[in-house]
């Protein structure tokens, strides 16, 4: 009875398409397939930037993979065949594993990479980005920033810089068609006379690093002798009301009397019969249902109600 | 497998010029620097210079004015040159792969006196 | 320049010893930029551990590494005859690079 055994997937390769991150796995079937032509052969792909405690698997009968990386470490990848159970009258039969690494091959000491890079989406209309220039480099160093998104078809070049002392220190982007909810690659790069210039790689989404607009048009109303309802509306632009998440600072007589957290457009504050003035300030971030992250907005404009008794209006801006 | 062998002269006169050359296998320089490290008994390891990859270089700035790196990528080769050596440069030279912003491989080392 | 100070300059540890030496940088150095070298009279350095934590290939599980900011450190969980050696850390932050003076591991 002859031990079944299979041999590893050939040419098995990390392709980098120039899309700063987003990289291809592949591969071709094992040599001596031909005893198992009634079999569908599985491969179990593994997978990981160096330094990372965890592997990525992924089982497939493909002969490719894509997923995105991060190009400021290398990344290491293995791969072995997989029998079913099926094929071989018995248990699941595996090859031995194929190795393979890649990584964007690093010139110039990390100092001399951009730093503190800080990427905002304003009011999930504008993207802009920003960063210092590496430490120690000189004003002859020039950083350019690329990026690339799923539905580009090649990473595009930053065409409106931001400039301090004739250095690039951002980018304001143009309009980013259907960007959101995929990862966002950027690449800076740099040139120097003086020294070689490390780039540097981020990916993220864009629908995390939105900063919206504060919220607009903050009204008072009397809903009964105790309570007061503060009223406000979202800001103008693209993000609907369901994406909001909200924080009000009241302050009642010159002290803070509360702060809180909403889901709506409405706050009901008790108050007392002493209240001789009430302000509040509200300021919005795109919450869970929307993102797995947010910046929040500036505060809203204070909206004050003072010199009459509470308790007999209605306030109105 | 990877292997750094280093080869150069062992003594060297006072204000003379110190050549070592690395010839590397089992990798490209096209695609990994080469750093260039010495120990000494009064100063430890201290780091000299790097050549990237792409050819440029990076230089301690101690060593800035007296030093050349370069390299050969069709020989696998990578030549260190330092001028004007003095008794304190005494030491064992090494060069050593780039790999992930570590040195992960070292060549044997080459022990230099500088004496007359 | 970014100083490493390593201490104790010189140690002893029994076998089965636990083993923690230190490396202190004048300024803060990213983690993923801080290694550890091992060198044995007469062989070159070799990597131990990188970015802080990270065992280079067929480093034992006895050692284990860690710190941030200014303060790092390595520790041998216990000493084995094959650890007595001079450990290096090392920065790759910023130029120059620079390495500690090193801590003697001697066995007991």
């Known amino acids: 009875d002859t031990e079944i055994k299979v041999n590893p997937p050939q040419d098995f390769e990390i392709v980098d398409p120039g899309y700063l991150g987003y990289l291809y796995l592949q591969w071709q079937p094992p040599l001596s397939l031909d005893h198992f032509k009634e079999c569908t052969v599985e491969y179990e792909l593994k997978y990981r930037n160096i330094g990372s405690e965890t592997w990525k698997t992924i089982i497939t009968k493909n002969l490719h993979y894509k997923d995105g990386f991060d190009l400021n470490k290398g990344i290491e990848a293995k791969i072995h065949t997989l029998l079913p159970w099926q094929c071989t009258n018995g248990s699941e039969v595996q090859s031995s594993w194929a190795e393979t690494t890649y990584w964007i091959s690093p010139q110039g000491i990390p100092e001399t990479k951009v730093q503190d890079m800080d990427c905002v989406y304003y009011n999930w209309q504008y993207l802009l980005c920003s960063w210092k220039p590496g430490i120690g480099v000189l004003l002859d160093t020039n950083y350019n920033l690329f990026y690339w998104y799923e539905g580009l078809d090649h990473a595009l070049q930053c065409v409106d810089y931001i400039k301090a002392d004739g250095q690039n220190i951002g980018c304001r982007f143009p309009y980013l068609e259907a960007s959101d909810y995929k990862d966002f690659y950027i690449c800076v790069n740099g040139s120097s006379e003086n020294k070689p210039i490390r780039s540097s790689y981020f990916t993220f989404q864009l629908q995390n690093i939105v900063k919206p607009l504060p919220p607009v048009y903050l009204t008072f109303t009397r809903e009964s002798s105790c309570e007061i309802k503060l009223k406000w509306s979202i800001p103008l632009g693209p993000i609907p009301a369901r994406c909001f998440d909200y924080e009000i600072e009241i302050r009642e007589d010159d002290t803070t009397l509360v702060t809180a957290t909403v889901e709506n457009e409405t706050y009901t504050l008790k108050t007392t019969n002493e209240t001789r003035q009430l302000c509040f300030v509200v300021r919005s971030k795109v919450n869970i249902y929307c993102s797995d992250d947010g910046i929040w907005s500036e505060w809203s404009d204070k909206q004050c109600w003072e010199g009459e008794d509470l308790s007999k209006k209605t306030l109105l801006r | 497998q990877v292997q750094l062998k280093q080869s150069g002269p062992g003594l060297v006169q006072p204000s003379q010029s110190l050549s070592i050359t690395c010839t590397v296998s089992?990798?490209?320089?096209?695609?990994?620097?080469v750093h260039w490290v010495r120990l000494s008994p009064g100063k430890g390891l201290e780091w000299l210079g790097v050549?990237?990859?792409?050819?440029?270089?990076d230089y301690n700035a101690a060593f800035i004015s007296r030093l050349n790196i370069s390299k050969d990528n069709s020989k696998s080769q990578v030549f260190f040159k330092m001028n004007s050596l003095q008794a304190n440069d005494t030491a064992i030279y090494y060069c050593?792969?780039?790999?992930?912003?570590?040195?992960?491989?070292w060549g044997q080392g080459t022990s230099v006196t500088v004496s007359s | 320049q970014i100083v490493l100070t390593q201490s104790p300059a010189i140690m002893s540890a029994s076998l089965g010893e636990r083993v923690t030496m230190t490396c202190t940088a004048s300024?803060?150095?990213?983690?993923?930029?801080l290694h550890w070298y091992q060198q044995k009279p007469g062989s070159s350095p070799k990597l131990w551990i990188f970015?802080?934590?990270n065992l280079a290939s067929g480093v034992p599980a006895r050692f284990s590494g860690s710190g941030s900011g200014t303060s790092y450190s390595l520790t041998i969980s216990s000493m084995e005859a094959e650890d007595a050696a001079t450990y290096y850390c090392?920065?790759?932050?910023?130029?120059?690079?620079?390495f500690g003076a090193g801590t003697k591991l001697e066995l007991k």
């Open positions: 050593a792969r780039d790999f992930g912003d570590t040195m992960d491989y």
């Open positions: 050549i990237w990859s792409g050819g440029s270089t």
């Open positions: 090392h920065q790759y932050h910023r130029s120059p690079l620079t």
């Open positions: 300024s803060s150095v990213t983690s993923s930029y």
């Open positions: 089992g990798f490209s320089i096209t695609k990994y620097g």
């Open positions: 970015s802080t934590s």
